[in-house]
Interface confidence: medium
């Protein structure tokens, strides 16, 4: 029975050329967190796995850096960075656990980021 | 940390067989999936097999027919079987291992980061 749950910095924004950090968090679960995969819409952004570390898909190694933690950092944001982004913890013995974040990129310097997400 | 060692190489006459093996030690969970590549001398490196998600697999157009690859999950060991042998598969085999995910089982070695240190296989009369 899968008990855990996944918090997630939500919906964010950001200003274009600027950078910002997508954070997952899986809780109330003793599960073994075995891969985290970062992905954007039907691409695959980066892999946290347990026991080979992190891997940064080639097309995205220049802007995509691992961390802080199981989080993603994106750099060099651009308008069409907007979009959904997963996490998806793969985890035994519970199965897979996934969590969205909705990343806006805005052209105006006043871009309105959302609270910074803590790890507890 | 992930180590490979590759094993089983050696000198083998065309039409021949070897069985290459690669244990996996210093994994805490296993969650990988493992690939064999190749370099000859002068030579790229280049894919020969990979066993993925679900247990697929997938094989260069070179070796199809002739090679097999299996794995071992309970003791991390993976295996290359090699059959009908040619001059031109004399080369270093390496055994790599990369994150499991559900994506295309390729031969693109650029999600390979783990590698062993590489066994040789020359196949000559």
């Known amino acids: 029975m899968m008990t855990g749950t996944i918090e997630t910095t939500g919906n964010i924004s950001a200003e274009k050329g600027g950078s910002i950090i997508l954070q997952c968090h899986l809780s109330s679960t003793t599960a073994q967190v075995t891969q985290v995969n970062w992905e954007q819409q039907d691409q695959l952004l980066a892999i946290c796995n347990a026991d080979l570390g992190w891997h940064i898909s080639p097309s995205f190694k220049d802007r995509v850096a691992p961390g802080p933690g199981l989080g993603l950092t994106l750099q060099s944001l651009t308008v069409n960075d907007t979009g959904e982004y997963f996490c998806i913890y793969h985890t035994y013995p519970d199965g897979t656990y996934t969590g969205r974040i909705f990343l806006e990129v805005l052209e105006s310097s006043v871009a309105e980021h959302g609270a910074r997400f803590q790890i507890p | 940390e992930v180590q490979l060692v590759e094993s089983g190489g050696g000198l083998v006459q065309p039409g021949g067989s070897l069985r290459l093996s690669c244990a996996a030690s210093?994994?805490?969970?296993?969650?990988?999936?493992m690939g064999w590549f190749r370099q000859a001398p002068g030579k790229e490196r280049e894919g020969v097999s990979a066993i993925c998600s679900g247990g697929r697999t997938t094989y260069s157009d070179s070796v199809k027919g002739r090679f097999t690859i299996s794995r071992d999950n309970s003791n991390q060991i993976l295996y290359l079987q090699m059959n009908s042998l040619r001059a031109e598969d004399t080369a270093v085999y390496y055994c790599?291992?990369?994150?499991?995910?559900?994506?295309?089982?390729?031969?693109?070695?650029?999600?390979?980061?783990?590698w062993g240190q590489g066994t040789l296989v020359t196949v000559s009369s």
């Open positions: 210093g994994y805490k969970y296993g969650v990988y999936s």
């Open positions: 790599a291992a990369r994150p499991l995910w559900t994506g295309d089982c390729d031969l693109s070695s650029s999600w390979y980061k783990t």
